[in-house]
């Protein structure tokens, strides 16, 4: 028998520095977690103690904090090189700055293979990107070889900016021939490493013949055997065992997100490459693990540029940006409009001639808007200003909901109106009218939404049975502020870009902004 240790991360999302327990900015260092300096300590400790170790990343290193905003992926290559990752799969967010924003900072600089079997380049891009990412890689580990085959969510064109010269094929269809190729090369230990979410990970384990282990990402799935060490609730045991169609037991793993845990899976293979046993658990990277001085010093060095960036002007406002709770928790506020407009603008994807865009709607809890921005400071808007407005380090995500769920959400928005509570919704691509004289749960008297399957966008009444795409904060997607109906009834959820980054990019693009209060939210006569 031969034993392999698989260390894995996924959805790190630019958390190079240690974070608080909820993966936001570290405040009390003695209680902080994760970060590449701490990860390095643990990885080196395991590498010293065990002979056959692979360190793998299942995608979405890009996007999530000011680190990515400023360094644009150079930080990912630098620190992943320092940690000597053995392989990485491409995630959807690796395309957030377009194909060039992937090629130059990461693909050309990485000292490890970057993989995806289901992304096919065409046209002029094919020769430019050739060899920079691979469908698979055979890695020597001790006296054996291990094949790693990559995959990426086929939804990437709707979630990011891969352009028109990359085709995202069905994962299972694309993976099978690559695994077959590895088998003909006498590689009998094969790991599928990818970024399509836990459901697809399980399908790959079930359907792709020859895959021995699946290491996934995208869905931020936390698996654990025994008593979990922090706040995350396990979605199943680690590893999650799938019985393949050809009768094999295939371990499937994922390690939550944000570099909070290091996935740790031990696999025992027989001489024919069959998995005999698999066991392990994610390791919580808490403060009991010291940060490595060499990596931490490098982090401190790179950090300086971030501090300078936060005070630089992104653009100007010529109007007061009203982000006060007195406004945003009671009525339409222009800060809410600005943020929602930025959210929609960030999700412009012309992937189908029938649609002007795949999504037109935004909702945003007023309680998530934490500060106004005064225009009387020469109109200057900085990252620092935006961090006061959106201090929670969240993301603006894409969900699919039925019209009936949206109606419930808008009823919840005003079910206890007047108490300055955070659930009052700011909107984009939606016209809502409330009648507060009616009883809670029956106060939405008009709800019109902007069409997407149209050449001239216009507002049509919401249809209860229709499925709509909506951009909203991850806080709402997870049921925050009492929006349990969104969490319970959503049909699809894909994590998006860092909230501040979305707004800062929009302001930089527009250069001068002047958002107005324009009648998106109305109260019927006599009730307000």
């Amino acid at each position: 028998a031969w034993e392999l240790t698989i260390l894995h991360t996924n959805d790190v999302h630019s958390r190079l520095e240690q974070t608080s327990e909820d993966s936001s900015k570290c405040v009390n260092a003695s209680r902080c977690m994760g970060g590449v300096a701490r990860l390095f300590t643990k990885v080196q400790q395991i590498r010293r103690a065990e002979p056959n170790v692979l360190l793998l990343d299942a995608g979405d290193q890009y996007q999530g904090t000011i680190w990515f905003t400023v360094y644009k992926g150079a930080e990912v290559a630098h620190f992943m090189n320092a940690l000597r990752y053995d392989a990485m799969a491409l995630g959807n967010h690796e395309f957030d700055n377009g194909v060039e924003g992937l090629i130059e900072p990461l693909l050309k600089e990485a000292k490890f293979p970057i993989l995806s079997a289901n992304i096919k380049a065409k046209g002029p891009l094919a020769s430019q990107i050739s060899g920079l990412y691979l469908p698979y890689k055979v890695l020597p580990v001790g006296d054996e070889v291990v094949g790693i085959v990559g995959y990426t969510s086929k939804e990437t064109p709707f979630l990011s900016n891969p352009g028109t010269n990359l085709v995202f094929e069905d994962e299972i269809t694309a993976l099978q021939p690559e695994v077959d190729k590895l088998k003909t090369l006498n590689v009998n230990k094969i790991i599928a490493l990818g970024h399509s979410g836990f459901e697809m990970d399980k399908l790959i384990a079930q359907k792709v013949r020859g895959v021995d282990v699946v290491v996934g990402g995208h869905s931020n799935t936390f698996l654990y055997t025994g008593n979990p060490p922090s706040k995350e609730v396990p979605a199943g045991k680690y590893p999650f065992i799938v019985t393949s169609d050809d009768g094999r037991k295939v371990p499937v793993v994922q390690a939550y997100a944000f570099g909070k845990y290091l996935g740790y899976l031990k696999i025992e293979f027989d001489e024919r490459g069959n998995v005999i046993s698999s066991h392990g658990n994610p390791i919580l990277l808490n403060s009991s693990i010291p940060e490595d001085p060499s990596i931490k010093a490098d982090i401190n060095k790179w950090r300086i540029k971030l501090d300078n960036y936060s005070t630089q002007e992104l653009g100007k406002t010529i109007v007061y940006l009203d982000g006060s709770s007195q406004s945003c928790r009671f009525r339409e506020c222009n800060m809410g409009n600005l943020i929602c407009d930025a959210m929609i603008n960030n999700n412009l994807r012309h992937t189908d001639e029938m649609f002007w865009n795949h999504v037109s709607m935004c909702i945003l809890n007023g309680g998530g808007i934490r500060s106004p921005i005064d225009e009387r400071n020469n109109g200057t808007i900085t990252w620092e200003n935006l961090a006061a407005v959106l201090p929670f380090g969240g993301t603006f995500d894409l969900v699919q909901l039925k019209g009936s769920t949206l109606k419930k959400a808008f009823e919840h928005s005003v079910h206890r109106y007047g108490q300055s509570t955070g659930e009052f919704l700011q909107v984009g691509g939606i016209h809502v009218v409330y009648d507060l004289s009616r009883k809670p749960g029956d106060r939405v008297v008009k709800l019109d939404v902007l069409c997407t399957k149209c050449r001239v966008p216009s507002y049509d009444p919401l249809k209860m049975d229709e499925v709509y795409k909506v951009i909203l904060p991850n806080f709402l997607a997870n049921g925050g502020d009492g929006f349990q109906m969104i969490k319970d009834e959503l049909l699809r959820h894909d994590s998006g870009d860092q909230d501040i980054n979305v707004v800062s990019t929009y302001i930089s693009k527009m250069k001068v902004i002047y958002p107005a209060v324009e009648g998106r939210i109305k109260f019927s006569t006599g009730s307000h």
Partner: antibody, heavy 120, light 111 residues
């Protein structure tokens, strides 16, 4: 178990060429830098240079630049230090030592040393 | 290049007693919040072994009696209770920048 095994002692004449080796095992060879250091009889230690076995990128101390060449062979997990023309002053013990691939990292594992004697 | 000066050149200490070795750098070896001073132990006929890195962090498997301190240019290696197996030459080394440089060594013997 991490091991760096160096080639045996060498006795050479001035002007001759020499290539000594350091075979790594117990870890992923391409995951760390390999450094070469010199220790002259009853003297301290001097860092000569390093190689990144992943892409063969090298970095030399100015003192040893153009005097020695550091190479690595990925498939055999072996690093090499070579001279094209030895001098009597090259007589010393030469060590290979591993370090994490970041500038400020220490030398965490060392080979047993190769004694080179250059004498006419 | 950063010049490292160790003192004393040799040191005789009774078993169980404290041994203290000093190392001074010609310029600061501090780098973004850390001091990159490392200490190695070399026994006769053996290669050096890492004891302490980044001024105060113990190397893997190093006994607790070895500790390091200091910042900037002045550093100390302390053996809290000298054991017979600690007889060796001890070297300091800076890894702030290349070329990495070593002190001349301190020979520790039993009194």
């Amino acid at each position: 178990e991490v091991q760096l095994v160096q080639s045996g002692a060498e006795v050479k004449k001035p002007g001759e060429s020499l290539k000594i080796s350091c075979k790594a095992s117990g870890y992923t060879f391409t995951g760390y830098w390999m450094n070469w250091l010199r220790q002259m009889p009853d003297k301290g230690l001097e860092w000569m240079g390093r190689i990144d076995p992943y892409d063969s990128e090298t970095h030399y101390s100015q003192k040893f630049k153009d005097k020695v060449t550091i190479t690595a062979h990925k498939s055999s997990s072996t690093a090499y230090l070579q001279w094209s023309s030895l001098k009597a002053s090259d007589s010393a013990i030469y060590y290979c030592a591993r370090s994490s691939p970041i500038t400020t990292a220490p030398f965490d594992y060392w080979g047993q040393g190769t004694t080179v004697t250059v004498s006419s | 290049d950063i010049v490292m000066t160790q003192s004393p050149a040799s040191l005789a200490v009774s078993l169980g007693e404290r041994a203290t070795i000093s190392c001074r750098a010609s310029e600061s070896v501090d780098y973004y919040g850390f001091s990159f001073m490392n200490w190695y132990q070399q026994k006769p006929g053996q290669p050096p072994k890492l004891l302490i890195y980044a001024a105060s962090t113990q190397g893997s498997g190093v006994p607790d009696r070895f500790s390091g301190s200091g910042s900037g240019t002045d550093f100390t290696l302390t053996i809290s209770s000298l054991q017979a197996e600690d007889v060796a030459v001890y070297y300091c080394q800076q890894s702030k920048e290349v070329p990495y440089t070593f002190g001349g060594g301190t020979k520790v013997e039993i009194k």
